[in-house]
C-alpha cells in the first residue's frame, strides 16, 4: 500500500498556503483526486509529488495515491480542507445525474470541518426538501439523497452556519432519470387493414414509455404523415397516440405504414399493410390435394384456407354423397382465425366408415358472393379374395375374383400338397396376371378384378393359391381339388372388418 | 491496460438527440473522472464535459444548456447526450480518462457523427 | 476560436530542435498546469507532456514542456521524421473547464 506524507487523513490549511503531498510507493505511483486549480505534479520513480504554493478553497477534497501495478489495488488517501472564512463549501459539480433508486451524492464539500455541526441541504431560494427526503452528510463527500426519485429532481443548495447567519453554496441541478428498460413499447393497430375504395380506415400508432423523452411518428412508405399527437400518462407510463383517420380511402393509401418510437436506449418500430380494393373478395384455397385418398378405419382432416373482406356471412361443410344422406356433425367442423382477412376451416373425420367416402364441399359466403371448394374421398381397402372352380368353354376354369381399392394385382401359385397357403418350399408353379379383367370400378368404390386359370387337369395333392395386393394389404384363398370335388380355403387371416 | 471504446449511431437527423455512450475495459470506472471531447474535421479538440462515476457533472458552459452526461458503474459504461442538434455538431467524439491536473491520459479511438437529414 | 493560441503550423528538419508555444491568460495557463498532446491523422490523441514539464512512461526524453505565466511551449530535440503530426495545448480555466488551443501541423521538411 502506498504511503502519504504529511501521514494524517486530513489536513487543514488556510487559503494562500503551499501545500505539498508526497506518495510513495514500492513501484510507481498516481495521484487522483477531484478537478481542482494550481495543482503540479511531479512523478520521480516510485514517488509522486502534488504541489501548490496557492492553496484555495478550490483544493479541498479528497486526494487519492495508488499503485497501478498494485494486483490488489491497495491506496492510501488524505482530505485537505482549506479553510476560506468566506467560502465554507467546495462544490464540485453543477449537475448530478443518477437512475431512480441510486444513492444522489451532491458534491458540496465543506472547506471548514468544524462547521459540521450546523450543515442542513435545502432547495434553492431557501425552500424545504421535499417530504420523505432521506438525506445523510458527510463532511468529505457532501450531501446523500438515499435512493433518489424521479420527483426529487430539483436544484439543491447546501447550507452552513457560519457566525450565526446561513451561508448557501452554489446550486447543484439533481436528475433522476428513470431507469429506461430499453426503446418505448409500440402498438400500430390493425396489424393488416383492408378496406374497398371509398370506405372509412382509421390507423392509430402508439407508443408508451416510464420517461416522457421519446418521439414517436408514422410513416405511409417511408414518408412522416404530419398528424396530430396526443398525450396521457397512465400506469407510470407516458403515451403518445397518433391517429389517423380516412373517410373514403382510394389506392393512394394504400400501402405500408410504420409506426416509429424513439429514445435514447434505441428505436422501436413496427409495420403493418394497407389494401385497397376495388369491391369484395372471397378466396377459397387449401394446401392439401383436393383429391385424397385415406385407408379405411383412419382418420383425416380437411382444411380450408379462406380469404375475404368483408368479413363471412355464412359458411358449411356439406356432404355431397354417393354413399348415404348424412352430413358432417358440426362438433367435427372447427374454425379458426389466423388474422382479420384470412381464416382456416378443418373437418375432422376419424376413424372413416366405408358410407364415409365421397365427395365433401366448403361453401362460404359474404357479400361478395358465394364460393365452393370441393375435396374428393376415396377409401383404400385391402384386396378380398375368393375363388371358384367352373367350366369355361368345356375346360376346366379357377376363376379368382379380388375387390380391393387401389386396384389390386394377381398372382397365381401352384404348390405340392394341400396347404392353407403355399410357402415357397413347396411352389411348383407360379402365374403373373397382368391384366386382370376389371369387373367394377365405380368412383369411390372398390375395384373388382377376376382372373382365370385355365387348368387342363386338377392335380389332386396339390394346391392352387390365388393372391391379390394392392398398397395397403394382401390377401388370398387356397383352392384344394378333392376327388369327391373342389375344396375351398380362405386364410386364416382373413377376417378383416372394416 | 484501461481501454475506452465510443458506441452510438454515425447518423443522426437535425434537431434529434445525439446519444453515445463509452465503454471502460481492462480498469473500475470508478473513483476516476471520466471526459468527452469533440473534434469536427480539419479542425482543433473541444472539451464537452466530465462525469465522476458518482454521477456529478461539469459541463462546457457553450453546450451546457444541450449536454446530458450519466453513468452505469454496474456497467462500467458512461454516456454522452446532446440534444437538439446541427450540422455544426459534426465531429469525431472521444471519451477519455481525465486526471488531477487535467490531463487525459486514456482515449477511446473515437466516432463519427454526421448530422443530417 | 479556440481559447489557447498555437501557431497553425511548425517545421524542421531531421535533428533540428522545434519549439511550438501555447499562449494563455491568467485564468487558464496562469493559474493551472498545462498538458500537451500528439495526434496522427485519423487516430486519436495521445498524452505527451502533463502539469507542465511530466513525460507519461514511453513517451521519449526529446519532448520537453515548460511553463512561464501565461504561455507554455513544447520542444522536440532531434527532430525525426514520425514526429510529424498535430500537436495541442490544454489547460482549465478557473472553472475547471478544458480548454485546447487551436492544434499546430508540424512538418519534418
Known amino acids: 500500500i502506498p504511503v502519504i506524507e504529511p501521514s494524517v487523513p486530513e489536513l487543514v490549511v488556510k487559503p494562500g498556503a503551499t501545500v505539498t503531498l508526497r506518495c510513495v510507493g514500492n513501484g510507481s505511483v498516481e495521484w487522483d483526486g477531484p478537478p481542482s486549480p494550481h495543482w503540479t505534479l511531479y512523478s520521480d520513480g516510485s514517488s509522486s509529488i502534488l504541489s501548490t504554493n496557492n492553496a484555495t478553497f478550490q483544493n479541498t477534497g479528497t486526494y487519492r495515491c495508488t499503485e497501478p501495478g498494485d494486483p490488489l489495488g491497495g491506496s492510501a488517501a488524505i482530505h485537505l480542507y482549506v479553510k476560506d472564512p468566506a467560502r465554507p463549501w467546495n462544490v464540485l459539480a453543477q449537475e448530478v445525474v443518477v437512475f431512480e433508486d441510486q444513492d444522489a451524492l451532491l458534491p458540496c464539500l465543506l472547506t471548514d470541518p468544524v462547521l459540521e455541526a450546523g450543515v442542513s441541504l435545502v432547495r434553492v431560494r431557501g425552500r424545504p426538501l421535499m417530504r420523505h427526503t432521506n438525506y445523510s452528510f458527510s463532511p468529505w463527500h457532501g450531501f446523500t439523497i438515499h435512493r433518489a426519485k424521479f420527483i426529487q429532481s430539483q436544484d439543491y443548495q447546501c447550507s452552513a452556519l457560519m457566525g450565526g447567519r446561513k451561508v448557501m453554496s452554489i446550486s447543484i441541478r439533481l436528475k433522476v432519470q428513470k431507469v429506461i428498460p430499453g426503446p418505448p413499447a409500440l402498438t400500430l393497430v390493425p396489424a393488416e387493414l383492408v378496406r374497398i375504395r371509398g370506405e372509412a380506415a382509421q390507423i392509430v400508432c402508439s407508443a408508451s414509455s416510464v420517461d416522457v423523452n421519446f418521439d414517436v411518428f408514422l410513416q405511409h412508405n417511408n414518408t412522416k404523415l404530419a398528424i396530430p399527437q396526443q398525450s396521457d400518462f397512465h400506469n407510470n407510463r407516458y403515451q403518445k397516440v397518433l391517429t389517423l383517420n380516412l373517410d373514403q380511402v382510394d389506392f393512394q393509401h394504400a400501402g405500408n405504414y410504420s409506426c416509429v418510437a424513439s429514445n435514447v436506449q434505441g428505436k422501436h418500430s413496427t409495420s403493418m399493410f394497407f389494401r385497397v380494393v376495388e369491391s369484395a373478395y372471397l378466396n377459397l384455397s387449401s394446401e392439401q390435394n383436393l383429391i385424397q385418398e385415406v385407408t379405411v378405419g383412419e382418420g383425416l382432416n380437411l382444411k380450408v384456407m379462406v380469404e375475404a373482406y368483408p368479413g363471412l356471412q355464412g359458411f358449411n361443410w356439406t356432404y355431397l354423397g354417393p354413399f348415404s344422406d348424412h352430413q358432417p356433425e358440426p362438433k367435427l367442423a372447427n374454425a379458426t382465425t389466423k388474422d382479420t382477412y384470412r381464416h382456416t376451416f378443418t373437418l375432422s373425420l376419424p376413424r372413416l366408415k366405408p358410407s364415409e367416402a365421397g365427395r365433401y364441399s366448403f361453401l362460404a359466403r359474404n357479400p361478395g358472393g358465394w364460393r365452393a371448394l370441393t375435396f374428393e374421398l376415396t377409401l383404400r381397402y385391402p384386396p378380398e379374395v375368393s375363388v371358384i372352380w367352373t367350366f369355361i368353354n368345356g375346360s376346366g376354369t379357377l376363376l379368382c375374383a379380388a375387390s380391393g381399392y387401389p386396384q389390386p394385382n394377381v398372382t397365381w401359385l401352384q404348390c405340392s400338397g394341400h396347404t392353407d397357403r403355399c410357402d415357397e418350399a413347396q411352389v411348383l408353379q407360379v402365374w403373373d396376371d397382368p391384366y386382370p379383367e376389371v369387373l367394377s370400378q365405380e368412383p369411390f368404390h372398390k375395384v373388382t378384378v377376376q382372373s382365370l386359370l385355365t387348368v387342363e387337369t386338377l392335380e389332386h395333392n396339390q394346391t392352387y393359391e390365388c393372391r391379390a395386393h394392392n398398397s395397403v394389404g394382401s390377401g388370398s384363398w387356397a383352392f384344394i381339388p378333392i376327388s369327391a370335388g373342389a375344396h375351398t380355403h380362405p386364410p386364416d387371416e382373413f377376417l378383416f372388418t372394416p | 491496460q484501461v481501454q475506452l471504446q465510443e458506441s452510438g449511431p454515425g447518423l443522426v437527423k437535425p434537431s434529434e438527440t445525439l446519444s453515445l455512450t463509452c465503454t471502460v475495459s481492462?480498469?473500475?470506472?470508478?473513483?476516476?473522472?471520466w471526459s468527452w471531447i469533440r473534434q469536427p474535421a480539419g479542425k482543433g479538440l473541444e472539451w464537452i464535459g466530465r462525469?465522476?462515476?458518482?454521477?456529478?457533472?461539469n459541463y462546457n458552459p457553450s453546450l451546457k444548456s444541450r449536454v446530458t452526461m450519466s453513468v452505469e458503474t454496474s456497467k462500467n459504461q458512461f454516456s454522452l447526450n446532446l440534444s437538439s442538434v446541427t450540422a455544426a455538431d459534426t465531429a469525431v467524439y472521444y471519451c477519455?480518462?481525465?486526471?488531477?491536473?487535467?490531463?487525459?491520459?486514456?482515449w477511446g479511438q473515437g466516432t463519427l457523427v454526421t448530422v443530417s437529414s | 476560436q479556440s481559447v489557447l493560441t498555437q501557431p497553425p503550423s511548425a517545421s524542421g528538419t531531421p535533428g533540428q530542435r522545434v519549439t511550438i508555444s501555447c499562449s494563455g491568460s491568467?485564468?487558464?495557463?496562469?493559474?493551472?498546469?498545462v498538458n500537451w498532446y500528439q495526434q496522427f491523422p485519423g487516430t486519436a490523441p495521445k498524452l505527451l507532456i502533463y502539469?507542465?514539464?511530466q513525460r507519461p512512461s514511453g513517451v521519449p526524453d526529446r519532448f520537453s514542456g515548460s511553463k512561464s505565466g501565461t504561455s507554455a511551449s513544447l520542444a522536440i530535440s532531434g527532430l525525426q521524421s514520425e514526429d510529424e503530426a498535430d500537436y495541442y495545448c490544454?489547460?482549465?480555466?478557473?472553472?475547471?473547464?478544458?480548454?485546447f488551443g487551436g492544434g499546430t501541423k508540424l512538418t519534418v521538411l
Open positions: 477519455a480518462r481525465e486526471r488531477i491536473t487535467g490531463h487525459f491520459d486514456y
Open positions: 481492462g480498469g473500475s470506472i470508478s473513483s476516476y473522472y
Open positions: 462525469i465522476y462515476s458518482s454521477g456529478t457533472t
Open positions: 491568467s485564468s487558464n495557463i496562469g493559474s493551472n498546469t
Open positions: 502539469s507542465n514539464n
Open positions: 490544454a489547460a482549465w480555466d478557473d472553472s475547471l473547464n478544458g480548454v
